[in-house]
C-alpha cells in the first residue's frame, strides 16, 4: 500500500479516505500513487503550502465538511493531473489569488457551502479547462465583471443560495458552452436585458426564489436550447407578451408563487415539448380564450390557489393532451358548460375549495376518460340529472362539504350515488345540509319521505331556508361524520438539494413533483 497513514483507509493503493475529528492536519505520508483522496469530517482548520506535493498523480481531491477556514496560495501545487477538486462544506471566507494556478486539468471545482464573500477574476483565470463550478451556499453579494471570462469551456455554473442583489449583463457573456446556470435563492430584483444573450447553449436556467419583479421582454430570446426554466417564488406581476416566444425546446416551466394577475392569450408558446405548467399561488383572476392554445403536448396544468372567478369557454382550447387539471382553491362560482369540452384526454380534475353553486349538465360531456373529480368544499346544493352517467372510468368522486339540499329534487343524484357508492371513497360521504330536519344525514341513505318537496327559491341567498342562517337549536343532532384530511403536503424535488414545501393535493393523483432547479 506504499504506506497508508494510520488515520486513513486505503481501500486500494489509489483510493485514500481520511475521516475523523482527531485529524487536525493533512495526514502523511500519503501513497505516492494515490489517484483519489478524501478528507472528510476532520478538524483541519488550514491547508499549508504544498501538503500534496508527493501525490502528483492525484485526479480527485475531496476536502469536505471540515473546519477549514484558511488555505495557503500554494496548497495545491504540483497537482497538474487533478480533474476534480471539492472544498465544499467548509468555513472558507476568502480564497487566495493563485490558489488554482497550475491545475491545468481541473474540470470540476466545488466551493459550495462555505462563507465566501467575494470572488475575483484572478481566482479562476488559470482554470481554462473547467467545466463545472459550484459556488452555491456562500455569502456572495455581487459577481464582478470578468469573473468567469476565462472559463470558456464551462458547462455548469451554480451561484444559488447566495446574497446576490444584482447581476451585471456582461458577467456571463463569454460562457457560450454553458448548459446549466443556477441563480436560485438569491436577492435578485431584476435581470438586465442581455444578461443571458451569450448563453446560446443554455439548457437549464434556475431563477426561483429571488425577488424578481419584472422580466425584460427579450430576456430569453437567444436561449433557443433552453429546456428547463424555473421562475417560481419571485415577485413577477406580469409577463411581457413575447417573453416565452422563442423557447421551442422548453419542457419544464415553473411560475408558481409569483404575483401574476393575468395571462394574455398566446403568452405561452409555441412550446411543443412542455408537459407540465405550474401556476399555483399567483393572483390570477380570470383565464381568457386560447391562453394555453400553443401548449399542444401539455399534460399537467396547475392553476390552484389563485383568485380565478371567471374562465372563458375557450380558455383551455388546444390542450388536447391534458391529463391533469387543478383548479382548486380559487373563487369560481360558475362554469360554462363548454369550458372542458376540448379536454378529451383529461383524467383528473380538482375543483375543490371554490364557491361553485351549480354545474351545467354538460360540463363533463366530452371528457369521457375522467377518473377523479374533486368537488368537495363548494356551495353545491344539487347536481344535474345524468352529469356523471357517461364517465365509465370514474373511480374517485369527492362531494362532501357541500350544502346539499335534500328535497325531492335530490332523488336522481341520491339514486346514482347509491349505485356508485365505492367511487365516493369510504372516508367521507356527502350529507344533507337542508332542510334542517335532515341536516347531517347521509345523502345516500336519506329517507326522502322525510325531506320536504322541492321549493325553488331565488339565487341569493343560495341556502334555501326561511333564513340562510337559521337558529338550529330546535333540531336534534342526527349523524356525525368522523373528520378526515384529504390535503397533503408533498415536497418538491430541487435538483440542487434545495426544497420547498407546497400543498397541492397531488397525492390523490399519485404523481411526483420535480419542479425546480
Amino acid at each position: 500500500y506504499y504506506g497508508c497513514p494510520s488515520e486513513c483507509t486505503c481501500s486500494r493503493a489509489s483510493q485514500v479516505e481520511c475521516t475523523g475529528a482527531r485529524i487536525v492536519a493533512v495526514p502523511t505520508p500519503l501513497p505516492w500513487n494515490a489517484m483519489s483522496l478524501q478528507i472528510l469530517n476532520t478538524h483541519i482548520t488550514e491547508l499549508s503550502e504544498s501538503p500534496f506535493l508527493n501525490i502528483s498523480a492525484l485526479i480527485a481531491l475531496r476536502i469536505e465538511k471540515n473546519e477549514l477556514s484558511h488555505i495557503m496560495p500554494g496548497a495545491f501545487r504540483n497537482l497538474g493531473s487533478l480533474r476534480y477538486l471539492s472544498l465544499a462544506n467548509n468555513k472558507l471566507q476568502v480564497l487566495p489569488i493563485g490558489l488554482f494556478q497550475g491545475l491545468d486539468s481541473l474540470e470540476s471545482l466545488l466551493l459550495s457551502s462555505n462563507q465566501l464573500v467575494q470572488i475575483q477574476p484572478a481566482h479562476f483565470s488559470q482554470c481554462s479547462n473547467l467545466k463545472e463550478l459550484q459556488l452555491h451556499g456562500n455569502h456572495l453579494e455581487y459577481i464582478p465583471d470578468g469573473a468567469f471570462d476565462h472559463l470558456v469551456g464551462l458547462t455548469k455554473l451554480n451561484l444559488g443560495k447566495n446574497s446576490l442583489t444584482h447581476i451585471s449583463p456582461r458577467v456571463f457573456q463569454h460562457l457560450g458552452n454553458l448548459q446549466v446556470l443556477r441563480l436560485y435563492e438569491n436577492r435578485l430584483t431584476d435581470i438586465p436585458m442581455g444578461t443571458f444573450d451569450g448563453l446560446v447553449n443554455l439548457q437549464e436556467l434556475a431563477l426561483q426564489q429571488n425577488q424578481i419583479g419584472l422580466l425584460s421582454p427579450g430576456l430569453f430570446h437567444n436561449n433557443h436550447n433552453l429546456q428547463r426554466l424555473y421562475l417560481s417564488n419571485n415577485h413577477i406581476s406580469q409577463l411581457p407578451p413575447s417573453i416565452f416566444m422563442q423557447l421551442p425546446q422548453l419542457n419544464r416551466l415553473t411560475l408558481f408563487g409569483n404575483s401574476l394577475k393575468e395571462l394574455s392569450p398566446g403568452i405561452f408558446g409555441p412550446m411543443p415539448n412542455l408537459r407540465e405548467l405550474w401556476l399555483y399561488d399567483n393572483h390570477i383572476t380570470s383565464l381568457p380564450d386560447n391562453v394555453f392554445s400553443n401548449l399542444r403536448q401539455l399534460q399537467v396544468l396547475i392553476l390552484s390557489r389563485n383568485q380565478i372567478s371567471f374562465i372563458s369557454p375557450g380558455a383551455f382550447n388546444g390542450l388536447t393532451e391534458l391529463r391533469e387539471l387543478s383548479l382548486h382553491t380559487n373563487a369560481l362560482q360558475d362554469l360554462d358548460g363548454n369550458v372542458f369540452r376540448m379536454l378529451a384526454n383529461l383524467q383528473n380534475i380538482s375543483l375543490q375549495n371554490n364557491r361553485l353553486r351549480q354545474l351545467p349538465g354538460n360540463i363533463f360531456a366530452n371528457v369521457n376518460g375522467l377518473m377523479t373529480i374533486q368537488l368537495q368544499n363548494n356551495q353545491l346544493e344539487n347536481l344535474p340529472l345524468g352529469i356523471f352517467d357517461h364517465l365509465g372510468k370514474l373511480c374517485e368522486l369527492r362531494l362532501y362539504d357541500n350544502p346539499w339540499r335534500c328535497d325531492s329534487d335530490i332523488l336522481p343524484l341520491r339514486n346514482w350515488l347509491l349505485l356508485n357508492q365505492p367511487r365516493l371513497g369510504t372516508d367521507t360521504v356527502p350529507v344533507c345540509f337542508s332542510p334542517a330536519n335532515v341536516r347531517g344525514q347521509s345523502l345516500i341513505i336519506i329517507n326522502v319521505n322525510v325531506a320536504v318537496p322541492s321549493v325553488h327559491v331565488p339565487e341569493v341567498p343560495s341556502y334555501p331556508e326561511t333564513s340562510w342562517y337559521p337558529d338550529t337549536s330546535s333540531y336534534p343532532d342526527t349523524t356525525s361524520i368522523s373528520s378526515t384530511t384529504e390535503l397533503t403536503s408533498p415536497v418538491e424535488d430541487y435538483t440542487d438539494l434545495t426544497t420547498i414545501q407546497v400543498t397541492d393535493d397531488r397525492s390523490v393523483w399519485g404523481m411526483t413533483q420535480a419542479q425546480s432547479g
Partner: antibody, heavy 121, light 107 residues
Framework: QVQLLESGGGLVQPGGSLRLSCAAS????????MSWVRQAPGKGLDWVSV????????FYTDSVKGRFTISRDNSENTLYLEMNSLRAEDTAVYFC??????????????WGQGTLVTVSS | IVLTQSPSSLSASVGDRVTITCRTS??????LGWYQQKPGKAPKLLIY???SLQSGVPSRFSGSGSGTDFTLTISSLQPEDFATYYC?????????FGQGTKVAIKR
Amino acid sequence: QVQLLESGGGLVQPGGSLRLSCAASGFTFSTFAMSWVRQAPGKGLDWVSVISGTGGSTFYTDSVKGRFTISRDNSENTLYLEMNSLRAEDTAVYFCAKAVTVNTRGFFDYWGQGTLVTVSS
Amino acid sequence: IVLTQSPSSLSASVGDRVTITCRTSQVIRNDLGWYQQKPGKAPKLLIYDASSLQSGVPSRFSGSGSGTDFTLTISSLQPEDFATYYCLQDNNYPWTFGQGTKVAIKR
C-alpha cells in the same frame, strides 16, 4: 340553543405550545365549518384558521402557517387549535366561531366568549 | 388582500344616518361580510355576501357594493348601535378583516 365554549388558554413562554379547545352544542356540529379568530388586546379582529365540516379542508393565515394546526372531532363536537412555536405577537383573545354553512365561508353566526392566550417570558 | 375602512372612527347622534366604507386592494366580487363588536363581547354578524341581511339583524342595517368598494349603512342610529364595525373578505385566503370603525356617541 347554540353554545361555543373555548378553553385551554393561559400564559406560555415564547417557543412554547398550547392547545385550545372549543366545545360545541345545540347544532349539528359536523355540518358546519368552524373557524378561529383572534383579537390582540386593544386591537382589531384577526382571522386565524378555518376548517370545513368534515375536516377535509383547512386554511390558515400566513403568520401561523406551519405553527398552528386546526382540527375537529365530530364525534365529540369539539374544535381544536394546536399552537406551537408561540411568539409574543400571538398574544390575543382567541374566539371560536361557527360558520353559516358546511363549506369554508367567512360568515360566522355564533361565537364563543373567547379564551386569552398570553405569550411572555 | 388588504381591507381599508373609513373613517377609523366617527361620532354621531341617535337618529343619524351613518355610512362606513370598506375598500379592498383587489376585486373580491361580493365576498364580504360586516360584523359589529361591543367592548368585551364577541363579534356579531350583520351582513353577508355584501348586501344580505343576517337573520335577526334590524332592517336599519344595510350593505351594498361589489368589486372593491363596499358600504355599511345604518339608516337611523340607535343607542345600542354604538360599537366597532369590521368588514371581512372571504374571497381569497388568507381571509382578512378591515382595521375597524368605532362609532361613538356625539357629545
